[in-house]
């Protein structure tokens, strides 16, 4: 199975608590209405932007308390035996290539951060997302070309890496020898995806790459 039901629920951000509250309010007012998620998200983020620090304080307190709860629960949490396998990442495996948007962010993050020093990680990412969406197709092209080149290189590298076979991870109690090659590859793909997610988090990237050129 995918997740361990005993694993502590992930910690929620102040904004997530705010959205949750908005949802509950909306449900109370319109119990039968179906929610247009993107519209709802937009309205929430607009409302959040106009809120004072005092108003946000309540949600920040909730987030702090939840962080403490999560850390407390994680201290006593023992993952199931098989789960340690996910933790192993071969340092020699080719790194998943960045997307065009990710490359663009690396270029313009310093400007956004410099111009708005107090901006949260999420808001920096949001501004970069808006910037990307307002960028004409031809101005995205250099980033798309570079991303395509890196993807091509990655595909060659990963093919060569798989052809060589992974280092003997079995010794580390990671991959059982009897697993089929297909399953092994599926897992590698999954790990690659997680790698990119982790990298994007490290790079302050929580922004979706919605490349909607007109």
């Amino acid at each position: 199975g995918k997740g361990d039901p005993k694993k502590p629920r992930g910690k929620m951000s102040s904004y997530a608590f705010f959205v949750q509250t908005c949802r509950e309010e909306h449900k109370k007012k319109h119990p039968d209405a179906s929610v247009n998620f993107s519209e709802f998200s937009k309205k929430c983020s607009e409302r959040w932007k106009t809120m004072s620090a005092k108003e946000k304080g309540k949600f920040e307190d909730m987030a702090k308390a939840d962080k403490a709860r999560y850390e407390r629960e994680m201290k006593t949490y023992i993952p199931p035996k098989g789960e340690t396998k996910k933790k192993f990442k071969d340092p020699n495996a080719p790194k998943r290539p960045p997307s065009a948007f990710f490359l663009f962010c690396s270029e313009y993050r310093p400007k956004i951060k410099g111009e708005h020093p107090g901006l949260s990680i999420g808001d920096v990412a949001k501004k970069l997302g808006e910037m990307w969406n307002n960028t004409a197709a031809d101005d995205k092209q250099p980033y798309e070309k570079k991303a395509a080149k890196l993807k091509e290189k990655y595909e060659k590298d990963i093919a060569a890496y798989r052809a060589k076979g992974k280092p003997d991870a079995a010794k580390k109690g990671v991959v059982k020898a009897e697993k089929s090659k297909k399953k092994k590859e599926e897992e590698e793909d999954e790990e690659d995806e997680e790698d990119e997610e982790e990298e994007e988090d490290e790079e302050d990237e929580e922004e979706e790459e919605d490349d909607d050129d007109e």
Epitope: E107, Y108, P110, K111, T135, A136, D139, Y143
Partner: antibody
Framework: EVQLLESGGGLVQPGGSLRLSCAAS????????TGWVRQAPGKGLEWVSG????????QYADSVKGRFTISRDNSKNTLYLQMNSLRAEDTAVYYC?????????????WGQGTLVTVSS | DIQMTQSPSSLSASVGDRVTIICRAN??????LNWYQQKPGKAPKLLIS???SLESGVPSRFSGSGSGTEFTLSISSLQPEDFASYYC?????????FGQGTNLEIR
């Protein structure tokens, strides 16, 4: 105050080379895309080339592709345009310009220009 | 390449007049249209970006409108310092082309 100051223009023979420089001050140079726009005597404006903040991404007009190279040195706050295989039609005032809005070519600040004359 | 055509090429007007310059693109450029003012022997100066956003420090008598392929720059009441050349530019597609210019002179 934002300032862009071009230098390096002059008279050069067809087939010759020239390197233009643009010294930037009054803003954080490494945050902005910058580029070159030229204007032939008595004529309109023509976009020549652009370069991303880090210098890792470049764009060129077809008329100069393969002959001109744009580069930047963020530690020196300077933009460059290396012009090779110059032709008579490259004669123009060359302006260095800053793109104020990300990668979009909206030139919010310009230098005073440097004249390049290609003639035998 | 996207062709930008300005009309008129030159225009005579008096102080206090309202003037309009038209810029047409030969294909849709959404709102990626900018206007510049250039005085003789000087560098161009950005007036309006994204069709209608006035740059800071630009007097409110300047305004821009349009979308798709047809755009206008209007000056509501001409001042002596407004006599100059005006260029439109598309920032939608490479190469980022300019109109041929409109020379605004005193009648």
């Amino acid at each position: 105050e934002v300032q862009l100051l071009e230098s390096g223009g002059g008279l050069v023979q067809p087939g010759g080379s020239l390197r233009l420089s643009c010294a930037a001050s009054g803003f954080t140079f490494s945050w902005y895309e910058t580029g070159w726009v030229r204007q032939a005597p008595g004529k309109g404006l023509e976009w020549v080339s652009g370069i991303s903040p880090s210098g890792g991404y470049t764009q060129y007009a077809d008329s100069v592709k393969g002959r001109f190279t744009i580069s930047r040195d963020n530690s020196k706050n300077t933009l460059y345009l290396q012009m090779n295989s110059l032709r008579a039609e490259d004669t123009a005032v060359y302006y260095c310009a800053r793109s104020g809005v990300g990668a979009t070519k909206i030139f919010d600040y310009w230098g005073q220009g440097t004249l390049v004359t290609v003639s035998s | 390449d996207i062709q930008m055509t300005q009309s008129p090429s030159s225009l005579s007007a008096s102080v206090g007049d309202r003037v309009t310059i038209i810029c047409r693109a030969n294909e849709r450029i959404n709102t990626y249209l900018n206007w510049y003012q250039q005085k003789p022997g000087k560098a161009p100066k950005l007036l309006i970006s994204g069709t209608s956003s006035l740059e800071s420090g630009v007097p409110s008598r300047f305004s821009g409108s349009g979308s798709g392929t047809e755009f206008t720059l209007s000056i509501s009441s001409l001042q002596p310092e407004d006599f100059a050349s005006y260029y439109c530019q598309q920032s939608y597609s490479s190469p980022y082309t300019f109109g041929q210019g409109t020379n605004l002179e005193i009648r």
